[in-house]
């Protein structure tokens, strides 16, 4: 805590400008009016304050807004955001996507910090659901964002938002998350034709049930092995050799290279040897 001292004569700040970088911590505390700082927050980012000086500025804002900063201030925090704790952020009410973007920009290129995670959580909870624009923004900054959400949190994602999801956004999703996302994707893409539908749904198939895989096997989709390996084991086991052959098309030869890995190993084990032999791959059940 900075001690309260009178501002030296002639040093009272009339605006936030570069002259303040020469102020000592106690001078900043004494000579910068918190209300002035709040109205000119956008200027702070253009001034090379030290981390210690930023601490003083944060302290002044905390005193002015003990219940949490207004969005007009939050939007212009810039790199002062890096000084905020998750506890500070929990007091905020962020509703503008522009504010969210501005703060994410500050942290760009870094791992998702606890501060950013809290900010996103507050924003999404404030909106009530993860809409398409928000999802677009979040996955642009953090491709793994979607897979960082619990299945419960993912349940609030409306099917319309699924259009914003790119294949790489699902790279780190586990089976439970794909179980939630797949039905939403199926709904979102339901009006597309066969080949276009498969291109869109492919990344989500780790959550697909057996009956959907059987349906896909009738559509000449030629699923690649990488996608097949991500399918749910319980969805793959009931598939017949003929259905897997149709599902994979020319990629069926890849089963040989994966015969010791799940779910291929589990599937092979449960097939009749006569049926496996029809593939001509030397697979042993």
């Amino acid at each position: 805590e900075v001690e309260k001292t009178a501002c030296p004569s002639g040093k009272k700040a009339r605006e936030i400008d570069e002259s303040l970088i020469f102020y000592k911590k106690w001078e900043l505390e004494a000579c910068v009016d918190a209300a002035l700082l709040a109205t000119q927050m956008d200027r702070v980012n253009a001034i090379p304050f030290t981390y210690e000086q930023l601490d003083v500025l944060k302290h002044k804002l905390d005193e002015l807004y003990p219940q949490g900063y207004p969005e007009s201030v939050i939007q212009h925090l810039g790199y002062l955001f890096l000084k905020m704790s998750p506890e500070d952020i929990r007091k905020w009410n962020v509703t503008s996507l522009e504010t969210l973007k501005a703060l994410l920009e500050v942290n760009k290129g870094h791992e998702m910090s606890p501060q950013v995670a809290t900010l996103i959580d507050r924003f999404v909870k404030g909106r009530g659901q993860l809409d398409k624009d928000t999802l677009d923004t979040l996955t642009a900054f953090y491709p793994g964002y979607l897979c960082s959400l619990s299945p419960e949190e993912l349940s609030s994602v409306p099917p319309s938002s699924i259009w914003a999801v790119r294949p790489q956004d699902l790279d780190t999703c586990d089976p439970r998350q794909l179980d939630v996302l797949y039905p939403k994707a199926r709904l979102a893409f339901q009006n597309m034709n066969g080949s276009e539908y498969f291109v869109k749904i492919q990344s989500f198939l780790g959550g697909a049930p057996t009956e959907d895989l059987k349906a896909l096997s009738q559509q000449n989709v030629s699923m690649d092995l990488a996608t097949f390996m991500k399918l749910r084991t319980d969805a793959v086991l009931p598939l017949t050799v003929a259905e897997v052959q149709k599902l994979l098309g020319p990629h069926v030869e890849g089963l040989k290279a994966e015969e010791r890995h799940r779910p291929v190993r589990d599937w092979i084990l449960r097939q009749r040897q006569d049926d496996l032999d029809t593939l001509g791959l030397g697979l042993q059940g």
């Epitope: 086991l237 010791r260 890995h261 449960r270």
Partner: antibody, heavy 119, light 107 residues
Framework: QVQLQESGPGLVKPSETLSLTCTVS??????????WSWIRQPPGKGLEWIGY???????NYNPSLKSRVTISVDTSKNQFSLKLSSVTAADTAVYYC???????????WGQGTMVTVSS | DIQMTQSPSSLSASVGDRVTITCRAS??????LNWYQQKPGKAPKLLIY???SLQSGVPSRFSGSGSGTDFTLTISSLQPEDFATYYC?????????FGGGTKVEIK
């Protein structure tokens, strides 16, 4: 409630064959979803998977033990068995049988049986 | 074969502590990772399967995360009955390898 129970001699001489049987009760060894494994744990050491069998008779063994291991299944008795040949002192361990449910893991284990290899 | 490396090999903690154990696979195993708890003289018990799914009957203070090669078992608030040895295991590859174990002891 499926339960597993290991049985067999607790002492085996070096160079002989270790034989153990696991009896499955409260369920069927012929289950579509399950494979049946043997796992061992030398005193004070970690777990080592030995191999599994499916009710069809298909087996899969740990490559490091493959040349000495045979696992068989008797569906009529609801049992599966382990034979480990040419044993040495290094094979002294607690031997567990376990069910591997295809959608999870080794979810049911026997209580284990200690086998000592010594002359 | 896929090697599984657990760390630390042992740790001391107090009741109420948050405990994290990591497991690393020598190659990608997708989400095929299980965690077991073993107490002295007892058979291991399945805690977590498929990296993050809680086995029926296991307290919710246990959680798992990770995919690919890096996985974590977390005990959010250690209880007296949690002092045991924990093993990770991969069922992805047919070699079914276990990690070396992590012994959680009382501080």
């Amino acid at each position: 409630q499926v339960q597993l129970q290991e049985s067999g001699p607790g002492l085996v001489k070096p160079s002989e064959t270790l034989s153990l049987t696991c009896t499955v009760s409260g369920g069927s060894v012929s289950s579509f979803t399950d494979t049946w494994s043997w796992i061992r744990q030398p005193p004070g050491k970690g777990l080592e998977w030995i191999g599994y069998i499916y009710y069809s008779g298909s087996t899969n063994y740990n490559p490091s033990l493959k040349s000495r291991v045979t696992i068989s299944v008797d569906t009529s008795k609801n049992q599966f068995s382990l034979k480990l040949s040419s044993v040495t002192a290094a094979d002294t361990a607690v031997y567990y049988c376990a069910r591997d449910f295809v959608l999870s893991g080794f979810d049911i284990w026997g209580q284990g049986t200690m086998v000592t290899v010594s002359s | 074969d896929i090697q599984m490396t657990q760390s630390p090999s042992s740790l001391s903690a107090s009741v109420g502590d948050r405990v994290t154990i990591t497991c690393r696979a020598s190659q990608s195993i997708s989400s095929y990772l299980n965690w077991y708890q073993q107490k002295p003289g007892k058979a291991p018990k399945l805690l977590i399967y498929a990296a993050s799914s809680l086995q029926s009957g296991v307290p919710s203070r246990f959680s798992g995360s990770g995919s690919g090669t890096d996985f974590t078992l977390t005990i959010s608030s250690l209880q007296p009955e949690d002092f045991a040895t924990y093993y990770c295991q991969q069922p992805y590859d047919a070699s079914y390898t276990f990690g070396g174990g992590t012994k959680v002891e009382i501080k």
